[in-house]
């Protein structure tokens, strides 16, 4: 019979491959059927009998056509900082990805092995580069004329409001405060109404960095001791 109509198992012509969804069994020296995804080889083929396939047991899988004797174990359940984006089935492994506000610090072939909380930029610092699924937020000091008054992993430095008359100059962590456009009659001429309390901080003084706390996760990232990232908190 020509190879196209032979039934498995069969001996391939010299120099010929096996066909679609078949493999060459070295022991039997025959082309034999592979097992479909979700199955594994329960009994290997012989010269006279084809592969016997069986379904994967619970919590195990095979994703590819195969002739493996045992299915692969699904990964462990997703941790509290993760969400399960793909369940463990007979044909696919469980996939865990980081929940919102976290990023993948250590990825694996599919999904994430280790999530870490996104850095929060504290007042006086804004987001220079947003966090992604696989990278942390990068903070930068707010440039003159801009400010951020929040502790946030998403807020950027915003421009100070422009005043006709400035009551309090803005700084890196506070917006400028403008005078009232129509002063009240009881006020002395030229008097400026200041909100209480009055900040005495000069306009562009940066807040002094606070000590960083370790990320609130149950693992240590593979890095030596280092100063806290500028303008970030460990919250």
């Amino acid at each position: 019979l020509p190879a196209q109509v032979a039934f498995t198992p069969y001996a391939p012509e010299p120099g010929s491959t096996c066909r679609l969804r078949e493999y060459y069994d070295q022991t039997a020296q025959m082309c034999c059927s592979k097992c479909s995804p979700g199955q594994h080889a329960k009994v290997f083929c012989t010269k006279t009998s084809d592969t016997v396939c069986d379904s994967c047991e619970d919590s195990t899988y095979t994703q590819l056509w195969n002739w493996v004797p045992e299915c692969l174990s699904c990964g462990s359940r997703c941790s509290s900082d993760q969400v399960e984006t793909q369940a463990c089935t007979r044909e696919q492994n469980r996939i865990c990805t980081c929940r919102p506000g976290w990023y993948c610090a250590l990825s694996k072939q599919e999904g994430c092995r280790l999530c870490a909380p996104l850095r929060k930029c504290r007042p006086g610092f804004g987001v220079a580069r947003p966090g992604t699924e696989t990278s942390d937020v990068v903070c930068k000091p707010c440039a003159p004329g801009t400010f951020s008054n929040t502790t946030s992993s998403t807020d950027i430095c915003r421009p100070h409001q422009i005043c006709n008359v400035v009551a309090i100059p803005g700084n890196a962590s506070m917006d400028a405060v403008c005078t009232s456009t129509s002063p009240t009659r009881s006020m002395a001429p030229g008097a400026v109404h200041l909100p209480q309390p009055v900040s005495t901080r000069s306009q562009h003084t940066q807040p002094t960095p606070e000590p960083s706390t370790a990320p609130s996760t149950s693992f240590l990232l593979p890095m030596g001791p280092s100063p806290p990232a500028e303008g970030s908190t460990g919250d």
Epitope: Q4, P12, G15, S16, R19, L20, R21, K34
Partner: antibody
């Protein structure tokens, strides 16, 4: 990125042979079949066969058996397809394509080599 | 050999349209149906394999359905770059065979 780059156009006389090359890059050459597919002017696509570079074993469509030879040079990640006893109806664009033998698809294609057979 | 036949050799549509291209196999091919896109002077591109699995990098507006002998490629909202020729191909048995192609043209 994964790429297949084919040799240039060829003009051949009836009865002659042609050898087209296909250089692979961006992946492990020996782990995927290289298929050859042709397309005659204004026609559809026609599968010629595949070669498995790891061992050089082949699978040819019966229509081309005895007239086609597929080979590979693993040192240069290059596949070759030689077609002999050319006829005018062999005039076509010949493509190499990386294949998947489980689902029978071609996921990366070369740019094509035009072979013209004319007396 | 398994014959693959598109329902039409050409199709006219406008940008934004929902387009379906169908393909019939001469015998049951299970789900082993693949779809390709070909543009003049460009390399052929795999769109969908195993009836409905989207190849990596292919926009989600492309989808595939069907089973046995009748299969459909759907483009949910036609984009200017989608005007091309589309081929179906069976991966069930050797020899691997293609349909004649459906040319998608601007209306």
């Amino acid at each position: 990125q994964v790429q297949l780059v084919q040799s240039g156009a060829e003009v051949k006389k009836p009865g002659a042979s042609v050898k087209v090359s296909c250089k692979a890059s961006g992946y492990t050459f020996i782990t995927y079949d290289i298929n050859w597919v042709r397309q005659a002017p204004g026609q559809g696509l026609e599968w010629i066969g595949w070669i498995y570079p790891r061992d050089g074993n082949t699978q040819y469509a019966q229509k081309f058996q005895g007239r086609v030879t597929m080979t590979t040079d693993t040192s240069t990640s290059t596949a070759y397809m030689e077609l002999r006893s050319l006829r005018s109806d062999d005039t076509a664009v010949y493509y190499c394509a990386r294949g998947d033998r489980d689902y029978g698809y071609f996921d990366v294609w070369g740019q094509g080599t035009t072979v013209t057979v004319s007396s | 050999d398994i014959q693959m036949t598109p329902s039409t050799s050409s199709l006219s549509a406008s940008v934004g349209d929902r387009v379906t291209i169908t393909c019939r196999a001469s015998q049951d091919i299970s789900n082993y149906l693949n779809w390709y896109q070909q543009k003049p002077g460009k390399a052929v591109k795999l769109l969908i394999y195993f009836k409905s699995k989207l190849h990596s990098g292919v926009p989600s507006r492309f989808s595939g359905s069907g089973s046995g002998t009748d299969f459909t490629l759907t483009i949910s909202s036609l984009q200017p770059e989608d005007f091309a020729t589309y081929y179906c191909q069976q991966g069930n048995t050797l020899p691997l065979t293609f349909g004649g192609g459906t040319k998608l043209e601007l209306k």
